[in-house]
Every structure is written in C-alpha cells, then in structure tokens.
C-alpha cells in the first residue's frame, strides 16, 4: 500500500532550521533507510506530498500553513503530517490535525504550548523544546545552589517570530514549576540603547543570575555596557541562551570559539566582560552515526536540493526529523503487525510516546506526552586562551549534569556568586545595616 | 440555481450578539424578503449551511471556526460565508476565505485588523467597527477643542475575548491618525483593586479626558474611587465606552436610564461621581422599519429558535446581518445580470463596497474598503433627574455630530475641561511656576 506523509514546511526560504532544503535531504535519507530495511513497512511505499508554511514573502505564516494543511488533507488524505516548525505556523496546523485525529510529527514547534496535548493531540516533537531547557536550568540551579532568584531577559527583533519570547516562556514556566523560585522576565528591543540602559538599571535590583536570549551581537553589546556600568564583576553571571550556538560559529573542529571577538576596537573589553558570561546551547550529538549522517545530508542537500549546508547545531533539527520519521514508520509497522491500519493515528502515536530509540542523533527518548528529552551543553571561557568550551553537559533522559573531564566552571570568586546578594538586592538585610552602623560608632 | 451561504457562528451559546439564535431569525427574515421580491435572484434558491464557531465549552474558538469553515467549503463549496463575529474566530476564517476568493460577510469582527483588506480580501463588515468609533471620538475632540492629549483605559476580563482590548486598539489607532494627539492607553484587571488604585495614581499625570472600556460595574467602581480620590471634579471627564448600552439597561421606552444606580449604599456618591461621566453607545436606529423588524425578529426567535430576545442595542447586530445579507443578494443579482456567476467573489464584493442601501437599520453606507459607516450616540446626565439621555448623535456617513434639540452637554465648569491642565500635568509650565514664585515673595 501507499503511506502518504504530508509535509508543511518552508519550501522556498532556506534560513529556517526546518526549511525543506535542510529537512528534505534528511527525509530522503530516512526513506532510503526504510527501503533498505525489510523489517520496516514491508510491501509499502512511503511518499511525501509538499505544502508550504510560508507566505509570499517567504516568512512562516499562521495562514499559509493551515491552508496548505487543509489542501493536502483534501487532496491526499495523508496518514501523517511532518512539520510545521515555526511556532505560529505549527499552532493552527496542530489544532487542525488534532481535530482530524491525524498524527503530526515535527522537530520544531518548540514553544511551551505544544506540550499541552489536550489541544495538540497526536503531536509528537522529535526535536528540542523550550520547557526541556527549563529542566536543564533547574538542574543547574540545584547544582549551584541558586534556589531563590533569577532574571530572564529576552530580545524582541522584528521578523524573528518572537523566538526569544517563546524560549523564555518555556524556560520561565518550567524553572518556576521545578524550583519554586522568584523569576523576573523582561523584554528589550535589540536596536534601542534605552532598552539596554533600563535593563542595566534594573539588574542590580532584580538579579545576579541572569539569562539572556538575544542575537550574539546584542549579547555582546549588553556585556560591554554591563562592564561599563560595573556589573560584570564577580557578583554577576550572564547566561547567553544561544541554543544553536550561533555565537560560537557552530561548526565542528578545533577552531577557537571566541564569542566576544569581532576584530574591532572593543575586543579587549569584550573579552574582559565575557569572564562573567556562560553560553547554553543544544548538545551536539557525539556518536559516529551523526557525523556520517551529516556527510550524507550535506551531499544530498547540494546534489538534489541545490543547497550548501553549513556546519553547526542547526543540523540537529533535520537529523531529528530523520529520527522522528523513522520512529513514526516503526510505530506504523508495529500497528499494522497488530492488525491496525495506517489511519489509526491514536494507536500509532501511543507507540511513539514514552519510548526510546537509537537514531542518528544518538539515544532518543520521547517522553510520556510525546516530547523528546533534550540534551544541552554549558560553555564557559578558558581564562587563559579566551576560548569558550563545553564544561558541562545535561542528559535530558537521566536529567543529570555531566562534567567534561578536566574542565570546570570558571568563577572569579572561586565559587558561584549567590543568586541574592549577601545583604539583599536593596541592602535590606537588617544584619548588614547593623554592621554598617557599628562601624560608625 | 442554488446559492449556498455557509454560516459560521455560535450555534449553541446564545450570549453573543451574533449567536445563531439571534442571527438565524434575521437571516430567515432576509430570505423571506428575497422570496417576496421578484427582482432579487429570480429563479434561484438561497440555502444556508451551518457550522459552529464555538468549541466544546460553547466559547468562540480560533480552531473550531476555521475547521467549520474548511468542512463547509469541502462539503458545500458555498458562494459566500456569513460570520464569524468573534474576533479570534473571524481572523483565521477571513484569511481562509480570502485565499479561497470567497466573499465573507459579517456584522461582527469589529477589530481594527479586519480593515486591512490585503489580508482580509472580500470581507465585508455590515456592522459596526471599532475604528469607526475612532472617527466619532476624533470628531468629538475637534468639536470640544481637545487636540492634545487623551487617556484610554481598558479592562481585561477572563473569557470576554479581549473585547475591550480590541475596542481601544481601534479607537486609539484611528484617533491618533485623525488628530495627531498624544494618547496613552492602560490595561487593568476588573477584579483587582490594586489595578484601580494604580490607575487613579496615573490619571492626574496622564489625562483629563479619559475613555474607559469596562463592564458597567467596573466603571461605577472606578468612578466611586475617583470621587473618593478627588478626581471627579470639573477638571475631568470620563467616557464609558459602553457600545451596547448595557449600563443603560438597553430597552425602548421612557424608563429613566440611571447607570449609577444599584439600590445600594453607594448610589448617592455614584450619582455625584457620574456628573463627570458620559456614555458612548452605538446609535439605536430610529426608523419605523427597525421597530417592525424587531417585532418580527423576536417572534421568530421565540417560535423557531426557542429563544427569548431582550430589548437593547445588541439587536442592531442581527439587524445588520439581515441588511448585509440583502445587500449581498442584491450584488449577486446585479453580477448575474451582467453575465457574471455566483462564484465571482471579486465582482460581487466590489458591488457591495462604496455603496449605500436602505435597510431595516436605516440608511446603510459601506465604505470604499468594505466597512460600514457607523453611527454613535453620546449620553449625558440630566443634572436635575440624574437620568442619562442622548445629547448628541454622530452620523458616520456624513461624519457629523448632530445635537439632540433642547439638550446640551453638561459641564460643571460651564465649558469642557481642557485636555491638558492649565499648568501642565506636572505643573511644568514655566509661567505657572513664575506665578507660584511671586506669591512667595
């Protein structure tokens, strides 16, 4: 028989991690693997039908995507949907597919809302999600003794689909649930200095452990301004939520990662400021299959999709689509073996959830509500060379922090700064005031 | 032939102005009128097919509505859509119908966004819209000499679909465009006293001419608190944006409208506070056809829809659906007469736009971008009786303010208070400081 998978992803714009130019080759490789494995869907052909989630400007759209989904449903009655990746595109499509009782599989749609499976029934996320970032940060706080206060800043940039809003939303909600700590969150516009200066006035009163989601340039600007304002000392720690490692120039290999460096007159100051910075990214899979997959992926992208794929963590997304599609096909195979049909979306989905799977991205665990456990890396500066390197990894499945041997977090004080200063944010601790008075007597 | 109109409105919940229990009888009356008129669609049958814009809880839904629209499109390929009315339901449906090039006709969807016909192509609004409220308020400001500053407050109430947000958005944007004045807008939660107290602290610094969108009870509470804080004197004017006249208990007839009255211990204070209040509503049509239509509407609602319709401005919405549907059918008739077809959505829509029409709601003018010109009434207190009555009407077509003979606006000072106090909000006018200093010498 024929198994039809309807794809709703950006078909023209190649800049999204889930653009078809990136995911298409991964899907091809997955389907080639299915063909080569007699235990997967024997006697069946898997075919993909394509619809675009972009509008005429090539931007993800909450109109184009559901319209594409509707057209594909009408014309092809697919067994499953692959994508969308963009939050605003995925939301209506996921609600439609839930109504149609058709599985939706994506390695995008990382926002918190998609974890609510009453609304997004049969949606499986084989890629990373922002609430899982909250699990990592909560584990980090426990490890470092920060159980009282944190500050989260997120940049608004026109046309970036509010990536940072959704990231901080997922992080904020999950950290608050896990730790029961006070978390403040503030938005700022990357292209207006007054937003930075207002943040710098707020920081001393609101936090010492500060998470920032922004572009690499905005993070560097904020660090330079913080240094200028005297907020980059040993009492503060700034985590750049740079999940795809843009500021580290992505890529494999031994090139030094110097996110503070621009080859301009501010490099010396920036390096100094970045002593107080750490960077959080997704974890690059380190299994040999992943490297082999990347080679094939790049080759196929160039040959069949006329697209040159750069190195970097962004490639974990096509890889996750690949693994998710294989997991789905595995679940369909099992459903058929148990007398079900390819249209039995509930049964197929249940076989994907609460399950682990060995994929090109390594060990993949889908949790009991259909979301992948996500691994993260924490990068810190080597004070000798100024290069950032991974000092700690987080295993989403075991929820453990794993130190990289021979490396440790760099703290100017020798230990993590407290999340609330010794005397409180406003020097309100009576004991401190008492000390202060006694020196005057 | 058959002309199919697909309805997407709340089918179960009767509380919306555009609930099917209210609009259904209006549609029946319109279709009866079409049958009775040989010049309208001769030889054609108009039939309606129904889909619900509500979710399982009976609440308007941005998922249920487009899904209903999709199902109706698949099954019936309608020539036009009627509804939705709710903003969040109408948005995806209007974008879908624009993509399908099918006319959408509604007397709801009053938010600013639906005026952007690039996105909502072929959407005609035969009912009132919030930007038109801005035209009225701009005309009022010009008349009263308020061309510098205004303050707009809007209540957030869980489950009311952000009615006040959208109302103030349309008002704010249009007033700002028309007058080039400074307009501040602030949200408050109706059920949190701290929000009221914060507003009262802000008011003296931000405005003297204040627009408030909220429930009648919240408006009364705010007025009582303002009185208590000394902000209800002659220097302030508070406009309650009560578009359906809820606080005036709707209804025909000579019953005194006393929005300050609750029969509680606060009535005396409330009456005093409401000296500084005015109320803005839609204008009740005063043509005899409207009264006749209401009689038939109520009868049909009771007989065929098992629903008892109350009096009030809310009935202008079903009446507007009635007139809009007749206008659509007129446009289809003309299109057919000119050799077009019922599927020629563009042509039909163009015949509805920039056109006037005599309906049960009186003289109806659709502007050049498909939105009805809207009439408003301004109510003020008769200081003798404490009853509110219409003192001024606004004609949307002519954009004129028309005083009701023998009535005038009641100003404690004898004239409208200035929109910026004589010495500025922070007493910053140097001339005033000069005076002030001289009294100290």
């Amino acid at each position: 028989g024929n198994l039809t998978v309807a794809v709703v992803l950006p078909l023209a714009n190649t800049s999204y991690p889930w653009s078809w130019a990136r995911v298409g080759p991964a899907v091809e490789l997955a389907l080639a693997r299915v063909k080569a494995r007699p235990d997967l869907l024997p006697g069946w052909t898997v075919r993909t039908v394509l619809g675009s989630s972009e509008n005429a400007l090539g931007v993800c759209s909450d109109t184009a995507a559901p319209l594409a989904a509707v057209d594909l449903k009408w014309e092809h009655n697919p067994a499953a949907f692959l994508g969308p990746g963009c939050v605003y595109a995925a939301a209506p499509v996921g609600r439609f597919t839930a109504h149609w009782r058709v599985p939706l599989l994506t390695a995008g749609a990382p926002a918190l809302g998609f974890g609510v499976k009453d609304e997004y029934a049969l949606t499986t996320r084989a890629g990373p999600s922002y609430a899982k970032l909250g699990d990592f940060v909560a584990a980090l706080h426990r490890r470092l003794g920060w159980e009282r206060q944190a500050l989260m800043l997120y940049a608004y940039r026109p046309g970036d689909e509010e990536h940072c809003f959704f990231l901080v939303e997922g992080l904020f909600m999950r950290v608050r649930d896990r730790l029961n700590i006070t978390v403040d969150h503030l938005e700022f516009a990357e292209d207006d200095l007054s937003h930075y200066t207002r943040l710098l006035r707020t920081m001393p009163r609101k936090g010492r452990v500060i998470y920032i989601c922004s572009s690499p340039d905005a993070f560097r600007t904020l660090m330079l301004l913080a240094l200028e304002a005297g907020l980059c000392g040993e009492d503060y720690v700034f985590f750049h939520l740079d999940i795809f490692g843009q500021s580290l120039q992505g890529g494999q290999g031994p090139a030094p990662r110097r996110p503070w460096e621009r080859g301009d007159g501010q490099d010396v100051s920036a390096r100094q400021a970045f002593q107080a910075a750490k960077i959080i990214t997704y974890k690059e899979p380190d299994n040999p299959e992943y490297l082999e997959f990347l080679k094939q992926l790049k080759h196929l992208a160039r040959e069949q999709f006329n697209f040159t794929m750069e190195d970097g963590l962004v490639n974990t997304i096509p890889a996750s689509f690949h693994d998710g599609l294989l997991l789905y096909i595995q679940a369909v195979t099992e459903t058929l073996a148990h007398g079900g049909t390819v249209t039995d979306g509930e049964n197929i989905t249940q076989r994907m959830w609460n399950r682990s799977f060995q994929g090109v991205t390594g060990y993949l665990k889908i949790d009991s509500s259909g979301d992948r456990e996500t691994d993260f890396s924490l990068w810190d500066m080597d004070p000798e060379t100024g290069a950032f390197r991974v000092v700690l990894n987080y295993n989403g499945t075991s929820q453990e922090l794993v130190a990289v041997s021979g490396r440790k977090l760099n703290w100017p004080l020798g230990y993590p700064p407290p999340d609330i200063p010794k005397c409180g944010f406003d020097n309100e601790d009576p004991a401190c005031n008492q000390d202060h008075l006694s020196t005057l007597e | 032939g058959n002309l199919t109109v697909a309805v997407v409105l709340p089918l179960a919940n009767t509380s919306y102005p555009w609930s099917w229990a209210r609009v259904g009888p209006a549609v029946e009356l319109a279709l009866a009128r079409v049958k009775a008129r040989p010049d309208l669609l001769p030889g054609w049958t108009v039939r309606t097919v129904l889909g619900s814009s509500e979710n399982a809880l009976g609440v308007c839904s941005d998922t249920a509505a487009p899904l209903a629209a999709v199902d109706l499109k698949w099954e019936h390929n309608p020539a036009a859509f009627l509804g939705p009315g709710c903003v969040y339901a109408a948005a995806p449906v209007g974008r879908f119908t624009a993509h399908w090039r099918v006319p959408l006709l509604t007397a709801g969807a009053p938010a600013l966004g639906f005026g952007v016909k690039d996105e909502y192509a072929l959407t005609t609004r035969a009912g009132p819209s919030y930007a038109k409220l801005g035209d009225f308020v701009a005309a009022l400001h010009r008349r009263l000499g308020w061309e510098r500053q205004a303050l707009m407050l809007y209540a957030y109430r869980p489950g009311d679909e952000e009615h006040c947000f959208f109302l103030v958005e349309g008002l704010f944007m249009r007033v700002r465009d028309r007058l080039n004045i400074t307009v501040d807008h602030l949200e408050f939660a109706e059920d949190d006293l701290s929000h009221y107290t914060r507003l009262l602290r802000t008011m003296p610094r931000k405005g003297r001419v204040i627009y408030i969108c909220s429930s009648p009870d919240a408006f009364r509470t705010l007025m009582l608190l303002a009185l208590e804080a000394g902000l209800c004197g002659e220097d302030y004017v508070f406009f309650h944006l009560d578009i359906f006249g809820q606080s005036l208990q709707g209804g025909q007839g000579p019953a005194p409208r006393r929005p300050w009255e609750r029969g509680d211990g606060q009535d005396v204070s409330a009456r005093q506070a409401f000296q500084a209040a005015k109320i803005i509503t839609y204008k009740e049509p005063d043509n005899p056809e409207y009264l006749e239509f209401l009689k038939q509407l109520k009868h049909l609602a009771r007989e065929q829809f098992n629903f008892t319709m109350e009096d009030g401005l809310v009935n202008t919405i079903p009446a507007s659906f009635h007139d809009g549907l007749l206008l659509y059918i007129q446009a289809v008739t003309e299109t057919l007469a000119h050799g077009g077809t019922v599927t020629d959505g563009e042509n039909i829509t163009q015949r509805m736009w920039n056109r006037s029409f005599q309906g049960v709601t009186g003289y109806l003018k659709i502007d050049s971008s498909g939105d009805r010109e809207t009439d408003f009434s301004l109510w003020d207190m008769d200081p003798e009786t404490g009853a509110f009555r219409v003192v001024l009407n606004y004609n949307g077509t002519s954009q004129e303010l028309v005083a009701v003979s023998g009535r005038k606006l009641n100003w404690p000072l004898g004239y409208p208070p200035p929109d910026i106090p004589k010495c500025g909000f922070d007493n910053e006018d140097p001339a005033c400081n000069q005076d002030h200093l001289s009294t100290l010498e």
Epitope: E190, D191, D192, L193, S194, Y196, T197, R198, L200, D217, T221, L224, L225, E228, A229, G230, R262, G263, D264, G265, Q266 | -
Partner: antibody
C-alpha cells in the same frame, strides 16, 4: 517625537567662553548617550565630545581636550557643553546628537547652534 | 584614532542612476558603521546603522553593506531629492570619526 534644540551660540572673542545647551524632548537623556558634533561652515563633520547613558564615561576629541566640559542635567532633560579658551578655528555649527553607542549610533540630530569666534 | 576614508569625494550622476559610495576604516570596526545624508543648511540625517540596517522612515532604495574595514552605501535609483552630501561614521570606539564626505551632484 524626538527633538533636540540647541542654544547658547553666538559671537565670542578669542580666549572667551560659551556654554551651549541642548533641550531634549520625546525621550529621556539618561536612557541614552549624548554627543556634540561640530561642522565648520562648508566643511565636514567632527565629533568633539560624548557622555554615556549613566554619566560614568566622558569622552573628548583631542582637538578640544582640556578646553571643553560636557555635562547633563537629567531633571531638565538637557545636555550642556562648556567651552573655554575659544579659538578662531572653533567657529562652527555645534550639533547636539543622541548617541546609541554600539546600537544605532548617532541617530537624532539637533539643527545646531552657531558659534563664531572673532575679534 | 580610527581614520575613515570615503571615496569618491564627489560624484556626478543622473536621476534613475544607481550609485555606490565606499568607506574604509583604518582598523576593524565590525559593523559599527553609520551613513548620513546632509543637505545644505540642514542637520545630517541618519540613513543606515550597523552597516546595513535602515533607520526607520528611510526608503529602501538606500542600502548598506560591509563589515570589518570596507563598507559601501548604494542608492538604487536616484531621485532629485537624493542629491546631497553623504558621510560615513564609525561608532565602535571613541573618539567617533567621520569620513570626509561625498558630494553627490546632478550631472
């Protein structure tokens, strides 16, 4: 609407002093850096002084260092430039400019106030 | 101090032409470069910041590019109102420095 209005220019003898003022509206000067830029009639633009958002950093061009002082009064939302020991070559139109260092640069300019140094 | 060298110093062009002005910094300034337009008797007006971002309200016929030390300003289709003097300026490091200007004249 952002507006910058300079005042205090005029004719002064060599060796004399002037205090230029800049009244800002539409934004708070303590949220931004502020700079002074001058232009000799018919010539190019020359940045002469800047103050950062919190007043903690002050910068001067070598050409005027030691002869000028930049300051700010947040309460009055104003910027000042005290100029001493003026020379004929300081004759120029002096612009007050909003300064978004590392973000948008010098984004809003006043029309300028003319300083003429002549005996 | 960082020297900014602009070329050409003057340029004659016709309405409808596409013109390019270049600016070179004596040391790396990443993308901290702005372009200004000045008309006689008026204050300079900011066109572009961060080498390629348009200030709000500036028409899209203006575009900028470059990073490090070499930058260009392009006007895609000259209109009569575009004839003016254009300056580049680095805002990476104090003291800020300007190019000497390019006078764009009608041919």
């Amino acid at each position: 609407e952002v507006q910058l209005v300079e005042s205090g220019g005029g004719v002064v003898r060599p060796g004399g002093s002037l205090r230029l003022s800049c009244a800002a509206s539409g934004f708070n000067v303590d949220d931004y850096g502020m700079s002074w830029v001058r232009q000799i009639p018919g010539k190019g633009l020359e940045w002469i002084s800047g103050i950062n958002w919190n007043g903690g950093r002050i910068y001067y061009a070598d050409s005027m260092k030691g002869r000028i002082t930049i300051s700010r009064d947040n309460a009055k939302n104003s910027l000042y430039l005290q100029m001493n020991s003026l020379r004929a070559e300081d004759t120029a139109l002096y612009h007050c400019v909003r300064d978004q260092w590392l973000v948008r640069g010098l984004d809003y300019w006043g029309q300028g106030t003319l300083v003429t140094v002549s005996s | 101090d960082i020297q900014m060298t602009q070329s050409p110093s003057s340029l004659s062009a016709s309405v409808g032409d596409r013109v390019t002005i270049t600016c070179r910094a004596s040391q790396g300034i990443y993308n901290y470069l702005a372009w200004f337009q000045q008309k006689p008797g008026k204050a300079p007006k900011s066109l572009i910041y961060a080498a390629s971002s348009l200030q709000s309200g500036v028409p899209s016929k203006f575009s900028g590019s470059g990073s490090g030390t070499d930058f260009t300003l392009t006007i895609s289709s000259l209109q009569p109102e575009d004839f003016a003097t254009y300056y580049c300026q680095q805002y990476n490091t104090y003291p800020y420095t300007f190019g000497q200007g390019t006078k764009l004249e009608i041919k």
